[in-house]
Interface confidence: low
């Protein structure tokens, strides 16, 4: 349904508060270096303009597209050329090329200082002095650091952020109340950002067919009692929502997400018995709840899949008649029966089934050719099962920090060309799979672990795309979305890599080590470990363990010394010399 004024339509649908929040997020995700005040000014101008269009949809410029209106506004920023360089060239383009140009310049790793958390009293004062500005600042700071953050979900995080301050700034012990809540929001926010980044990568790099396949599998696991057509409708709507958000169309995205939540709550009976408690909540919470809802119980009487997909003589007829629908139904039927499989495994099985039909339906005896297709699935299923089993055993044996270190060594040997900060970030996150998934019952381990690893490896892929250094990484990232994790798992020591020259500066430490938090100390040590492996890629586990144990002992000794800096100056070179000898 067309509207005379798109901006008036969205303003009326979303309401002023959400409209302003979403425009701020959109602008902050595009112009990540602009100061907060500049963005607030732009948002206020757009909001005032939207109000004139609500009053009179025929007013001047009200008929312009949102991309035109927002792009024109972004292009009024005076310092565009100085701050963003070639991004300023986007402003010479017409829509839709201009918006595509802005999208291409989104930076997944912007050069922004880490957010420092002020004292609790300082934060509470700022919250009470100007709550609106305080919350806008939160949206701005998160959005500019996470340019693909799912915008309507960020509004939900902001609402929780507001609630935490409203509650805790009244509490007797403000810090005890507030800090755990902020930690939880930070960790959940990072996870949410990374999950959305995979959705956007899936849509942008592999197309909406890949995203739809992912969504069919995931929604079929969540809603196994729903009909295929119901799942297909949800997939179509969800694809539209995420395509819009990933494309920077945040107002449309939020509006359509609200419509989807409304539809799901009005049609619970044909979707899932688990939606009830979500549907009583207010909009932002409801949408979040629906996205995170647990899997419904599987229908008790599901027949064997073999009848329709292997034994039937009509398989090739059915496949030829409507390939995507037939494969979609196969994926739906398989996924609803297997909540214990990862989505990526289900997609690999569907891919294998498709490849078999492509080959067999052209054969002299198709039925004979595809009769054993389900047997071919066994190795595909066993591979992630074994991987999860082995890595959970290793995690339980080592604990999280040492498990991360094992992964750091493993991945540095596979792709030593990748930058050290990226290897540390990615390996630390890969290592978090242990605490997240290994404690779960067997039936939930694989979906938890492999689908989490896909999210983390996507982060490696988007960072690597910005500065490509390894053909192996490029190959694993671009050849097949569903086979990314197996591709990385299969990589061995890079024999072609020329070891990095030893640089004593890399292994020179100072007394500031002693004032770091436990996490920051770990990152420092893990950075040194990566550099060691880059210097000696063929070092054994035992050699590396010896060096790292010595390192820990050396840091502990100097942090206990009276003159810490003198200790680091004296003991540091000894540690470096001993390490070189140990690795020779």
């Amino acid at each position: 349904d067309t509207h005379k004024s798109e901006v008036a339509h969205r303003f009326k649908d979303l309401g002023e508060e959400h409209f302003k929040g979403l425009v701020l997020v959109a602008f902050s995700q595009y112009l990540q270096q602009c100061p907060f005040e500049e963005h607030v000014k732009l948002v206020n101008e757009v909001t005032e303009f939207a109000k004139t269009c609500v009053a009179d949809e025929s007013a001047e410029n009200c008929d312009k597209s949102l991309h035109t209106l927002f792009g024109d506004k972004l292009c009024t920023v005076a310092t565009l050329r100085e701050t963003y360089g070639e991004m300023a060239d986007c402003c010479a383009k017409q829509e839709p090329e201009r918006n595509e140009c802005f999208l291409q310049h989104k930076d997944d790793n912007p050069n922004l200082p880490p957010l420092v958390r002020p004292e609790v009293d300082v934060m509470c004062t700022a919250f009470h002095d100007n709550e609106a500005t305080f919350l806008k600042k939160y949206l701005y700071e998160v959005a500019r650091r996470h340019p693909y953050f799912y915008a309507p979900e960020l509004l939900f995080f902001a609402a929780r952020y507001k609630a935490a301050f409203a509650e805790c700034c009244q509490a007797a012990d403000k810090a005890a109340c507030l800090l755990p809540k902020l930690d939880e929001l930070r960790d959940e926010g990072k996870a949410s950002s990374a999950k959305q980044r995979l959705k956007c990568a899936s849509l942008q790099k592999f197309g909406d067919r890949a995203f739809k396949a992912w969504a069919v599998a995931r929604l079929s696991q969540k809603f196994p009692k729903a009909e295929f057509a119901e799942v297909s409708k949800l997939v179509t709507d969800l694809t539209k929502v995420h395509t819009e958000c990933c494309h920077g169309d945040l107002l449309e995205c939020a509006d359509d997400r609200a419509d989807l939540a409304k539809y799901m709550c009005e049609n619970q009976d044909s979707i899932s018995s688990k939606l009830k408690e979500c549907c009583d909540k207010p909009l932002l919470e409801k949408s979040h709840c629906l996205a995170e809802v647990e899997n419904d119980e599987m229908p008790a009487d599901l027949p064997s899949l073999a009848a329709d997909y292997v034994e039937s003589k009509d398989v090739c007829k059915n496949y030829a008649e409507a390939k995507d629908v037939f494969l979609g139904m196969f994926l739906y039927e398989y996924a609803r029966r297997h909540p214990d499989y990862s989505v990526m495994l289900l997609l690999r099985l569907a891919k294998a089934y498709e490849a078999t039909l492509e080959k067999c339906c052209a054969a002299a005896d198709p039925h004979e050719c595809y009769a054993k297709v389900f047997d071919e699935f066994q190795p595909l299923v066993e591979e992630p099962q074994n991987l999860v089993k082995q890595n959970c055993e290793l995690f339980e044996q080592l604990g999280e920090y040492k498990f991360q270190n094992a992964l750091l060594v493993r991945y540095t040997k596979k792709v030593p060309q990748v930058s050290t900060p990226t290897l540390v970030e990615v390996s630390r996150n890969l290592g978090k799979v242990g605490a997240k998934c290994c404690k779960l019952p067997e039936a939930k381990r694989m979906p938890c672990a492999e689908d989490y690893l896909s999210v983390v490896l996507n982060r490696l892929c988007v960072l690597h795309e910005k500065t490509p250094v390894s053909e192996k990484v490029t190959k694993c990232c671009t050849e097949s979305l569903v086979n990314r994790r197996p591709c990385f798992s299969a990589l061995e020591l890079d024999e072609a890599y020329v070891p990095k020259a030893f640089n004593a500066e890399t292994f020179t430490f100072h007394a500031d080590m002693c004032t770091l938090s436990e996490k920051e100390k770990q990152v420092k040590k893990q950075t040194a470990l990566v550099e060691l492996v880059k210097h000696k890629p063929k070092a054994t586990k035992e050699q590396l363990k010896g060096v790292m144990d010595n390192f820990a002992a050396f840091v502990e000794k100097c942090c206990k010394a009276d003159d810490k800096e003198a200790c680091f100056a004296e003991e540091g070179p000894k540690f470096v010399a001993a390490s070189q000898a140990a690795l020779a």
Epitope: A229, E230, S232, A322
Partner: nanobody, 117 residues
Framework: QVQLVESGGGLVQPGGSLRLSCAAS????????MSWVRQAPAKGPERVSA????????IYADSVKGRFTISRDNAKNTLYLQMNSLKPEDTAVYYC??????????PGQGTQVTVSS
């Protein structure tokens, strides 16, 4: 909510004709292949005919070839089955389904076709 409502069935003499309709709602009809499936008493479901999403491809069971014609009107979200030269063995409940499955998709009750003199 997905809905498929079949109509047009009835009692007809051998050699007679019927036109079945299936009104679809709650999903993007034009994106899916559709099928007619029938189930006779004490028998399993049999796919009678299927049609691709744009109507360009059709498939018929050997038992109905040359007698039945499947068609669709995407503008009206409706699927049709024209049945000519009906035989007693065509007696069954006829369902429309989404895609090429023989499992009824949605809460359609089907429409009873009885061929008898």
């Amino acid at each position: 909510q997905v809905q498929l409502v079949e109509s047009g069935g009835g009692l007809v003499q051998p050699g007679g004709s019927l036109r079945l309709s299936c009104a679809a709602s709650g999903f993007t009809f034009g994106q899916f292949g559709m099928s007619w499936v029938r189930q006779a008493p004490a028998k399993g479901p049999e796919r009678v005919s299927a049609i691709s999403s744009d109507g360009s491809g059709t498939i018929y069971a050997d038992s109905v070839k040359g007698r039945f014609t499947i068609s669709r009107d995407n503008a009206k979200n409706t699927l049709y089955l024209q049945m000519n030269s009906l035989k007693p063995e065509d007696t069954a409940v006829y369902y429309c389904t989404i895609g090429s499955s023989t499992t009824p998709s949605g809460p359609g009750q089907g429409t009873q076709v009885t061929v008898s003199s």
